[in-house]
Interface confidence: low
């Protein structure tokens, strides 16, 4: 049986008399301790199952050394079973037991919800010895109770390797409702249903929920916790909260903002980081995402040239990182660049356009009509070519690069020469006789080195041979000509 005490009720005795159907035969109030009367019979019967031996939470003692009489079984006396009080109040409760003096070294420990309470708890054990028995009162006090103090408290006593356990004392701390789930901020599609949840607990139960939208109650009748609010859709931002009510009063949840998803704002601060002849590296600062994650971005590129057809090139890229290298551009050209980004709702407007230019490119064609002569008397090779027909985007010609490779039995050596842009001929010294010389020429601008011409080979004989006809750039598709002396 459990007795119950409420804080609002009149004070209850620490140790009430025997409960209906209880096994306690000692009718003396423990408040008059030290004192003990009478013994309980050695064999106890369960009040719930008459006629059946009851062995729970009692120690059956042995015969005394004199063998003269049986000692009583030991059990904690019944006490208050249920204490209900408000948060921040103080509480004190006890358990008591009378132990024959033949038992030595008795210790009482307190347990809560199956775990021993150790350390900084306010537990006091008092001993009241008499001729034959010692009355022991174990008190446990909690100052300013919290919800975490809720639970079932018991005393345990170890005696002669037996363990005696008291009836539980249930502590119920009541207070204002406590939220276990509050509504969360959300970003929702316009006119689309969504749900909010609010859950609060006591004790005391029940906890009832009212929903509040923009400071106005949504539901006239409260809903029992937990409550799910289905909002059929919003056209504009709203703030929701919930009120949790119980017998102790009201708690209000945090207010959460429900945002309406919209197209993003346009990106800002489009910047040029690096330009080459055929690419531009840009970055941008994303605009406001419209309460929906960016999915991707579009880089739009227009050539700024009166002769261009004004078409726009579009390059799609991921939304992050906020950088993109625009490729496949013309060299030495001007471009207007804008960026737009999208989320699940749609595309933003385009950012402010910025101007950017590519740098000079390397020549795209090689010098023409490359011809090679052997001038044996001077022991050099005479090379001639025609200036390539470069586009303006390649920039200004600054010179030529000549590669000549000398090959004879098992030896190969490449040499490079640079000549100015006004030249269309050059002379190079013979490096090796009885060898083949292979010549290639490339045009050079500030943008870089262009492609080399097709190779032209000439055979350099041993000393004493006469001048011979030149070698020249072959027609496309023909094998490289080699002049054999």
């Amino acid at each position: 049986a459990i007795t119950e005490a409420r804080e609002e009720a009149k004070p209850y005795p620490l140790f009430p008399g025997p409960l209906p159907g209880s096994l306690q035969t000692d009718h003396t109030s423990l408040l008059s301790l030290p004192h003990t009367s009478g013994y309980q019979p050695a064999l106890m019967f369960s009040p719930t199952q008459p006629g059946r031996p009851y062995t729970g939470n009692v120690a059956i003692p042995r015969v005394t050394s004199a063998g003269s009489k049986l000692l009583p079984p030991l059990a904690f006396k019944h006490t208050v079973g249920h204490i209900i009080l408000s948060e921040h109040k103080d509480v004190k409760f006890n358990c008591s037991i009378s132990v024959p003096n033949i038992y030595q070294d008795t210790t009482i420990s307190w347990w809560k919800d199956g775990k021993e309470l150790l350390g900084a708890h306010h537990a006091i054990t008092q001993f009241y010895p008499d001729d034959e028995v010692t009355a022991i009162i174990a008190s446990f006090s909690i100052t300013s109770v919290q919800r975490s103090d809720n639970g079932s408290y018991i005393c345990k006593m170890k005696i002669n390797n037996e363990e005696i356990v008291s009836d539980p004392i249930y502590i119920e701390v009541q207070g204002l409702p406590h939220f276990t789930k509050q509504p969360e901020s959300m970003n929702v599609t316009r006119n689309t249903a969504f749900n909010l949840t609010c859950q609060a607990v006591g004790p005391p139960e029940p906890v009832n929920i009212f929903w509040v939208q923009n400071s106005s109650r949504v539901n006239e009748q409260p809903e029992k916790s937990p409550s799910v609010l289905t909002v059929p859709g919003l056209t504009e931002m709203a703030v929701f909260s919930c009120e949790a009510h119980n017998d102790k009063g009201l708690t209000v949840s945090k207010g959460v903002q429900i945002n309406i998803k919209a197209i993003p704002s346009p990106p800002t601060e489009v910047s040029i980081h690096n330009s080459t002849a055929h690419s531009i590296l840009i970055s941008w600062v994303p605009g406001f995402d419209g309460y929906s994650p960016f999915r991707n971005c579009s880089v739009q590129v227009k050539e700024v040239d009166p002769l261009s057809n004004g078409s726009v090139m579009i390059f799609n890229t991921s939304a992050s990182p906020h950088m993109y290298q625009i490729k496949q551009l013309q060299a030495l050209a001007n471009y207007s660049i804008g960026v737009s980004c999208m989320n699940e709702i749609g595309w933003s407007a385009v950012s402010p356009w910025i101007l950017a230019s590519t740098t000079e490119g390397a020549p795209s064609v090689a010098p023409l009509n490359v011809t090679v002569f052997l001038n044996e008397s001077r022991d050099n090779v005479d090379i001639r070519w025609m200036k390539p027909l470069t586009k303006r985007q390649a920039g200004e010609l600054v010179g030529y690069r000549i590669s000549h490779v000398w090959q004879s039995a098992g030896i190969s050596k490449e040499l490079l020469e640079e000549v100015g842009q006004n030249n269309s001929r050059a002379q190079i010294s013979v490096q090796v006789h009885n060898a083949t010389c292979t010549v290639r020429i490339a045009a050079v601008t500030k943008g870089g080195v262009g492609p080399f011409s097709d190779p032209v080979k000439i055979f350099i004989p041993a000393h004493g041979w006469v001048d011979h006809a030149p070698s020249s750039t072959p027609a496309p598709g023909n094998a490289d000509p080699v002049l054999i002396i």
Partner: antibody
Framework: QVTLKESGPGMLQSSQTLSLTCSFS??????????VSWIRQPSGKGLEWLAH???????RYNTSLQSRLTISKDTSRNQVFLKITSVDTADTATYFC???????????????WGQGTTLTVSS | DIQMTQSPSSLSASLGGKVTITCKAS??????IAWYQHKPGKGPRLLIH???TLQPGIPSRFSGSGSGRDYSFSISNLEPEDLATYYC????????FGGGTKLEIK
């Protein structure tokens, strides 16, 4: 992209304890509103929800199995675990984990699932 | 606990045809129902949530309706890849699945 993958022992004897792991990527259980559930499907039968864990370590269990189930998580390793004690042949099934929808509103449904791991319990 | 009664447990239909599956909840579930397609060896695939909202990428051949305790799910213009088992899920209070409907194509 969101993926979930279940792993388990494959076979157990009756009365043993089953330990399952759900490893996931593409989302974090530290994100408000997230949750992961365990669901099973005995061979030839329907789906049965077992247990759920929210981002804030709040747990929910199927009432008929509650005494045998323990769900837990390791947020830093992107894993959710399920223990079932005292298995018997009735626990032979394919076990799935599913992610609770990514928005912070409740209640919610499972939007991504793993492919399942099969358990056979022999007597 | 909320119970979900799904019917029929199996059905057969012709290509190009239409099928309808129903789920009845043991109490009002406030439209909090989702529908899944499940094929052997794979995880279930979410088709519809909140009674009738189609998941991104799911064809409009799939549809759902209902309120209170009674909900239905339809597939029109049946295609061979629709061969699967379909489940309803209530998520109004915890989660409960219907018993499933095995769809066969004639």
């Amino acid at each position: 992209q969101v993926t979930l993958k279940e792993s388990g022992p494959g076979m157990l004897q009756s009365s043993q304890t089953l330990s399952l792991t759900c490893s996931f990527s593409g989302f974090s259980l530290s994100t408000s509103g997230m949750g992961v559930s365990w669901i099973r499907q005995p061979s030839g039968k329907g789906l049965e929800w077992l247990a759920h864990i929210y981002w804030d370590d709040d747990k929910r269990y199927n009432t008929s199995l509650q005494s045998r189930l323990t769900i837990s998580k390791d947020t830093s390793r992107n894993q959710v675990f399920l223990k079932i004690t005292s298995v018997d042949t009735a626990d032979t099934a394919t076990y799935f984990c599913g992610r609770l929808g990514a928005y912070s509103a409740f209640p919610y449904y499972f939007d991504y699932w793993g492919q399942g791991t099969t358990l056979t319990v022999s007597s | 606990d909320i119970q979900m009664t799904q019917s029929p447990s199996s059905l057969s239909a012709s290509l190009g045809g239409k099928v309808t599956i129903t789920c009845k909840a043991s109490q009002d579930i406030h439209k909090h129902i989702a529908w899944y397609q499940h094929k052997p060896g794979k995880g279930p695939r979410l088709l519809i949530h909140y009674t009738s909202t189609l998941q991104p990428g799911i064809p409009s051949r799939f549809s759902g309706s209902g309120s209170g305790r009674d909900y239905s799910f339809s597939i029109s213009n049946l295609e061979p890849e629709d061969l699967a088992t379909y489940y309803c899920l209530q998520y109004d209070n915890l989660w409960t699945f219907g018993g499933g409907t095995k769809l066969e194509i004639k």
